[in-house]
């Protein structure tokens, strides 16, 4: 749930959590499932050519509170959502890219030439 451009990080669990991983699978993952003491996440961001790329995986408890806060980054369109309520909960996360700012419409074509 986002308010004012931020998403609140969910509460961590007292047991290991399994998450779906895609484009972000650590070495210890098996069959696109990773495990964590923190959160599952799904993230959407623009690649260098402006195409949306969806990534999902595990975030360790250490530092994930910050990572799960969807703090806007200048000149970078991305959105992340985190969950812990059940295993592979990130299968049901569907973050959307934040809308283009007016500046981006002006700058966009120049950057992508």
């Amino acid at each position: 749930k986002k308010e004012d451009g931020e998403s609140t990080a969910p509460t961590p669990r007292p047991k290991i959590l399994r998450c779906k991983c895609h484009h972000h699978c650590p070495e210890d993952s098996v069959n696109n499932i990773c495990s964590t003491d923190g959160y599952c996440f799904t993230m959407i961001e623009e690649d260098d050519s402006g195409m949306p790329v969806v990534t999902s995986g595990c975030l360790g408890l250490e530092g994930s509170d910050f990572q799960c806060r969807d703090t806007p980054i200048p000149h970078q369109r991305r959105s992340i959502e985190c969950c812990t309520e059940r295993n592979e909960c990130n299968k049901d996360l569907h973050p959307t890219l934040p809308p283009l700012k007016n500046r981006d419409f002006v700058d966009g074509p120049i950057h992508h030439k």
Partner: antibody
Framework: QVQLQQPGAELVKPGASVKLSCKAS????????MQWVKQRPGQGLEWIGE????????LYNQKFKGKATLTVDTSSSTAYMQLSSLTSEDSAVYYC?????????WGLGTTLTVSS | DVVMTQTPLSLPVSLGDQASIFCRSS???????????LHWYLQKPGQSPKLLIY???NRFSGVPDRFSGSGSGTDFTLKISRVEAEDLGVYFC?????????FGSGTKLEIK
Amino acid sequence: QVQLQQPGAELVKPGASVKLSCKASGYTFTSYWMQWVKQRPGQGLEWIGEIDPSDNYTLYNQKFKGKATLTVDTSSSTAYMQLSSLTSEDSAVYYCARFGYYVDYWGLGTTLTVSS
Amino acid sequence: DVVMTQTPLSLPVSLGDQASIFCRSSQSLVHSTGNTYLHWYLQKPGQSPKLLIYKVSNRFSGVPDRFSGSGSGTDFTLKISRVEAEDLGVYFCSQSTHVPFTFGSGTKLEIK
């Protein structure tokens, strides 16, 4: 205190199936995974798989897929493992064990004997 | 699967001696979260295993301080500073970093 109660022994015929039980007490059942481990004399310990009682999510050792099926009944805080198409190779002690990030408590084990 | 190699298979000791048991994994047990999920258990005859040490070096509640664990990556050690009669049994190392979770073959601690 944490307790995992298992029947002491089961005797079944080859080709049959058996459903082993593990009744948990002394903690919130849905707050931990339940694992199952096989021990045969001289063969060490083998991890069969695990189930999260909060959402019935299971993970299996590839070696036991098709052999073992893990389920839970949260109303009675009981975990079950069904073993099918039994052969003498399935004769062993089977332990249930509580798992958070590591196994901290084990059941006393059920000795399964497969014999005609 | 990760292979856990335990040495020695048998360890004859005198009561009061120090004992060391070694465990080597076929790949690193450092999890992507930074934790190392390597644990030690003691199984006495006719009993189920009991947790001694979790995550390399943390003593489980009620475990005497004569037990200590150390190591990193792929090489781990369990030390018993002064062996007592109640310590006799089979010691297993176990990893829960990689699925399927695996165990060492065991080290039997016995009286010399």
